[in-house]
Amino acid sequence: APVRSLNCTLRDSQQKSLVMSGPYELKALHLQGQDMEQQVVFSMSFVQGEESNDKIPVALGLKEKNLYLSCVLKDDKPTLQLESVDPKNYPKKKMEKRFVFNKIEINNKLEFESAQFPNWYISTSQAENMPVFLGGTKGGQDITDFTMQFVSS
């Protein structure tokens, strides 16, 4: 069966939107009006993995682009990147672990934990116009809470 996907945008708990920053990076900043068109639309695919009531494994692709958020070790540190894939083969139900995030819902907020690196989360900074990254701390300076907005196909 084909993998189930939905289109959405994400905003952090400070209401910063996510936009492209160069070819293989995302950044977070406040957008208004027409600038909202800059925000990235994700194709969130529901993939195979450990699942529970509040934890759902997903892959985050960029809509109509052959790019997926992935988690890899760089300089011995878990790192978030945008990775190019062959569009003929993706998305698929059994995604490689580096592409998988545990979507965790807590108090109407979402966290995205790396399946490859437990306790590492998609993070943004309090600062404007700074990169989205994989952070190993929750509840500190870095923001790990997001809201999801559905986008019609």
Epitope: G22, A127, M130, Q141
Partner: antibody, heavy 118, light 107 residues
């Protein structure tokens, strides 16, 4: 008053190592992204590295990737740059700078000179 | 990487002149541009951020304009302390990049 004070520069042979420090005061250091920027003698400015407030995210210029490491100790209000495998072309004044709104450098240190020569 | 091209690379001017420095980005950087002033032996000083916003404490004779790929720094009525080198810097994406600088000399 915001102050940034670099130290640790000096003369080093090619292939050698140095560790630069930047002592910050006059602001809540742990809330700010920080940069290292360098300037070769008589040349323009070159961005070297950035670190997030928690230290959770770092980035480097291609010219130093794999050789330089940025880090910070928020308990000591200090930023570091560990420089290994130094080359003649790394000779420059190294500035630490606080990141302001949207990615500019709103405050700079006075700089520390690193000379790589045999 | 985004290339930043400044022009002119040097210019001679007199006190009281109006001076315009141009900075071009190799791709759209929205308004994520800063301007700095550097005098010999000193660290750079932020003048303008977000293309048009004057940094606190900077005299109002400095102004910035532009968005996308083309930006200008204007100094109305040059003062003796304005003879320096000026740099633009894009903050749209990493690696951050600077223009090559514009040296403003006394005519």
């Amino acid at each position: 008053e915001v102050q940034l004070l670099e130290s640790g520069g000096g003369l080093v042979q090619p292939g050698g190592s140095l560790r630069l420090s930047c002592a910050a005061s006059g602001f809540t250091f742990s809330k700010y992204w920080m940069f290292w920027v360098r300037q070769a003698p008589g040349k323009g400015l070159e961005w070297v590295s950035v670190i997030s407030p928690s230290g959770g995210m770092t980035r480097y210029a291609d010219s130093v990737k794999g050789r330089f490491t940025i880090s910070r100790d928020n308990s000591k209000n200090t930023l570091y740059l560990q420089m290994n495998s130094l080359r003649a072309e790394d000779t420059a004044v190294y500035y630490c700078a606080r990141v302001g709104y949207g990615g500019n450098s709103d405050y700079w240190g006075q700089g520390t000179l690193v000379t790589v020569s045999s | 990487d985004i290339q930043m091209t400044q022009s002119p690379s040097s210019v001679s001017a007199s006190v009281g002149d109006r001076l315009t420095i141009i900075c071009r980005a190799s791709q759209d950087i929205n308004r994520w541009l800063a301007w700095y002033q550097q005098t010999p032996g000193n660290a750079p000083k932020l003048l303008i951020h977000s293309a048009t916003s004057l940094q606190s404490g900077v005299p109002s004779r400095f102004s910035g304009s532009g968005s996308g790929t083309d930006f200008t720094l204007t100094i109305n009525s040059l003062q003796p302390e304005d003879f320096a080198t000026y740099y633009c810097q894009q903050a749209d994406s990493f690696p951050l990049t600077f223009g090559g600088g514009t040296k403003v000399e006394i005519k």
